[in-house]
């Protein structure tokens, strides 16, 4: 059933036009091409249409010659450029980058046929849902200048002023599959920036060409004031070279997108070289500001550091005489202000207003280095008393109530003596088990400890145990981070293995092995030795997400994701630097939950005397990163089904 | 990364004297603590002295009263000066140095120590 009706027309083009139509009982799109439409044109589509049969193209149905037709399936919910132009709201992130996955992976498919696209430009991408998880959000329509290549090239000049490749609108120059490459970087680019080129080309069509074929597209977070999204900022950076051979191939654009760090790294600022972080703490998430205070600098010096992530903004003061260790937040609800506290080596606790920076006095002075900061939240309510927790290098904990770090000198409540010189006090941790509000957990030396808000300590754990087999040798080693769930997830210095420890057995229950995992990850290349690879796992900082996963962070510059309750495997982020420092939960603004990163890279300076350069790295990452990756392997298996089907049913 | 080099090891007599020297050199950016380590033939292991940022000590029961750790921040070294050396002092010596936040630990190659007549 088809009626030539202005209400069933969906589109027009140079070759005729599209209808809605019925088709045995589906709705469907009916493409008429002119009455002056060559054959060719007719044969050439029909050809790519019943030869091709993928998850990513627009099917064809049935062809017709008298009138010259095809008929294909419809996509309900249009083009991508009416959804860049009408509906910006609806694209999520989520959303950007299945679409663009989705037509990664057609055009992969195609090149993989020996054919270049040639038209690839929102107006040809059609949408038929935009539920993010469906298996076909995205498809590829409009075959009509689509053309089989051989390993030459071909010469002709097609496509659409503001779409094609440098190489392409030239003319009489031989372009082959990298040309479509070019143009999936500008699609990117529209879909990341949400159409506003497009916008723009429209009111000064004769620029539009110019501007991207010599590469001067303005910068899309700048210009267009879109959120940054660093991994397909430099995708679309690589699609658009302009030699075509330093553009990745369609097949590496789609491995690239098939990453779900590629959709949850949602922010990568390098910090001033050797400016060297030792720590950090997000502002209040009540705050409007999403910001973050790092310490750092020397053994002689310390510096305070205040990032603005929002305009990444970076401030930086020497305010101590040593280096600085750890930081803590203090807020202070009733008198509505808030407290940056900087533990630091020298024993030192200065502490420092967050509106006010000149408002600034010390703590009384501790007996050794400052190795952690806590300040707890026992209770949300005022009527309780909440503290900031002090360990120190020497094993003690000092205990200050909050409101106290306000006053000059202010001497703590209480001193716990834990340890001594030979364990430090290096870690205090909130259990995230709803079941154990009041009660907190250290590490000291080799042992656990926790205790609750009168400050008596109720548990202590001897951790040495001859229970590491071949990691025996860090049993010794002091404890440098813990995190509590459900059970106790404890860090050595310099070991490779996380303990898992049960708190009311106070018995070893499990071993995470960093070697084993990384090792399963490289075992294709075969990159490290197990020596090698034991100090790059070595276990740096840990983080909880809650009823989730835990986060380990290595000396080598690896992430590792776990799942919490069955201690699987998420995903290794290798090599994401040269080494991970600080992993931290934050609610920042607009940015909601994220996890912070942080770490260093390493550079070789140039000169005779190989100095290192340390640089360090700050990375926000979305904290749906564990669902996303699992969601990602469900959506691309569900796909690659779904094009074995269809690529069975064509052979039929 | 951190490079230790031991050096000042070597044979001496029961009563006689020895000063260790430990030098740190490579990416540096913070070094905490210093400390010399012992490991005789069949035995495990064990702290012989320790010593702060600030100057804090700790001492190793068998040679409290006897050796004394001292360290030059400036030239990142430290030193264990062994007065009163017994036969059961005889081992490889190692310094350790802890760097970075405490959480970054290096050890030195050793250096023999023979107190023997």
């Known amino acids: 059933e088809f009626e030539q009706a202005p209400e069933f027309l969906l589109g027009d083009g140079s070759f005729g036009s599209v209808y809605r139509a019925a088709y045995e009982g589906e709705e469907v799109a009916v493409k008429i091409f002119n009455k002056h439409t060559s054959l060719r044109l007719l044969r050439q589509e029909l050809v790519v249409l019943c030869h091709l049969h993928h998850p990513s193209l627009i099917s064809l149905l049935a062809a017709g010659i008298r009138p010259r037709m095809l008929v294909m399936e419809l996509a309900s919910k249009g083009s991508l450029d009416r959804l860049l132009q009408q509906d910006k709201a609806s694209l999520t992130r989520t959303l950007q980058h299945r679409i663009a996955l989705h037509v990664a992976d057609g055009l992969r498919y195609l090149h993989s046929a020996m054919i270049i696209y040639r038209d690839l430009k929102p107006h040809n991408v059609l949408l038929f849902t935009l539920y993010p998880n469906a298996a076909i959000i995205a498809k590829i329509a409009d075959y009509g200048i689509a053309q089989y290549c051989c390993r030459m090239g071909i010469k002709t000049s097609e496509g659409t002023p503001g779409f094609r490749a440098p190489e392409v609108a030239r003319g009489n120059v031989i372009y082959n599959q990298q040309a479509d490459v070019y143009s999936f970087g500008l699609l990117l680019y529209d879909i990341l920036t949400t159409g506003g080129r497009i916008v723009e080309g429209l009111k000064f069509p004769n620029e539009f060409d110019e501007l991207e074929i010599q590469g001067k597209l303005p910068d899309p977070v700048k210009e267009y004031g879109c959120a940054p999204w660093p991994m397909v900022e430099k995708l679309i950076k690589q699609c658009l070279k302009e030699n075509p051979q330093e553009r990745p191939t369609s097949a590496q654009v789609f491995d690239i997108l098939n990453s779900a760090e590629l959709v949850c790294l949602t922010r990568r600022i390098l910090l001033p070289k050797n400016v060297i972080v030792e720590c950090m703490v997000a502002t209040h998430h009540n705050s409007r500001n999403a910001s973050i205070w790092l310490g750092c600098g020397h053994t002689d010096r310390g510096q305070l550091s205040f990032l603005d992530l929002n305009t990444e903004g970076y401030t930086s003061e020497e305010v101590a005489d040593s280096r600085i260790l750890c930081l803590a937040l203090v807020h202070l609800p009733v008198e509505k202000e808030s407290w940056i506290v900087s533990g630091t080596q020298s024993g030192t606790l200065l502490v420092i207003n967050t509106e006010d920076g000149k408002k600034r006095h010390t703590l009384e002075k501790m007996t050794d280095s400052v190795t952690c900061l806590y300040c707890n939240s026992f209770s949300k309510q005022s009527k309780q008393k909440n503290f900031l927790l002090v360990g120190t290098a020497d094993g003690k904990l000092a205990i200050f109530e909050d409101k106290t770090v306000k006053l000059k000198g202010a001497a703590p409540l209480k001193i716990l003596n834990i340890g001594n010189v030979s364990t430090p006090l290096m870690c205090l941790s909130e259990s995230t088990n709803s079941t154990e509000r009041n009660v907190m957990w250290g590490g000291c030396g080799t042992k656990i400890f926790s205790f609750s808000n009168d400050f008596t300590i109720q548990k202590l754990i001897e951790t040495r145990t001859s229970q590491l087999f071949s990691y025996a040798a860090f049993s010794d080693s002091n404890i440098i981070t813990v995190v509590v769930d459900t059970a106790l997830y404890i860090a050595k210095q310099n070991s490779p293995v996380v303990e898992v420890w049960d708190k009311k057995t106070e018995k070893l229950c499990g071993l995470i092995d960093c070697v084993h995992f990384l090792r399963e990850v490289t075992v294709k290349e075969n990159k490290e030795s197990k020596h090698k690879m034991s100090y790059s796992g070595r276990v740096k900082t840990l983080c909880l997400q809650k009823n989730t996963a835990l986060w380990i962070g290595t000396g080598g510059g690896h992430i590792l994701l776990l799942d919490l309750s069955t201690r699987r495997l998420i995903r290794v982020i290798y090599n994401f630097c040269n080494s991970v420092r600080v992993m931290m939960t934050a609610q920042l603004g607009s940015l909601k939950n994220v996890m912070l990163v942080l770490g260093y890279n390493r550079k070789n300076t140039e000169g005779t005397q190989k100095q290192k350069e340390i640089q360090s790295c700050l990375t926000v990452w979305d904290i749906n990163l564990p669902h996303e990756v699992q969601n990602l392997e469900k959506h691309i298996e569900v796909r690659k089904e779904l094009a074995e089907k269809m690529r069975r049913t064509s052979v039929e | 990364q951190v490079q230790l080099v031991e050096s000042g090891g070597g044979l001496v007599q029961p009563g006689g004297s020895l000063r260790l020297s430990c030098v740190a050199s490579g990416t540096i950016y913070a070094i905490n603590r210093m400390g010399w380590y012992r490991q005789a033939p069949g035995k495990q292991r064990e702290l012989v002295a320790l010593?702060?940022?600030?100057?804090?000590?700790n001492y190793g029961d068998s040679v409290k009263g006897r050796f004394t750790i001292s360290r030059d921040n400036a030239k990142n070294t430290g030193y264990l000066q062994m007065n009163s050396l017994k036969p059961e002092d005889t081992a490889v010596y190692y310094c350790?140095?802890?760097?970075?936040?405490?959480?970054?630990?290096?050890w030195g190659q050793g250096t023999q120590v023979t107190v023997s007549s």
């Open positions: 010593i702060t940022l600030g100057g804090g000590t």
């Open positions: 350790k140095v802890e760097s970075s936040g405490y959480t970054d630990v290096f």
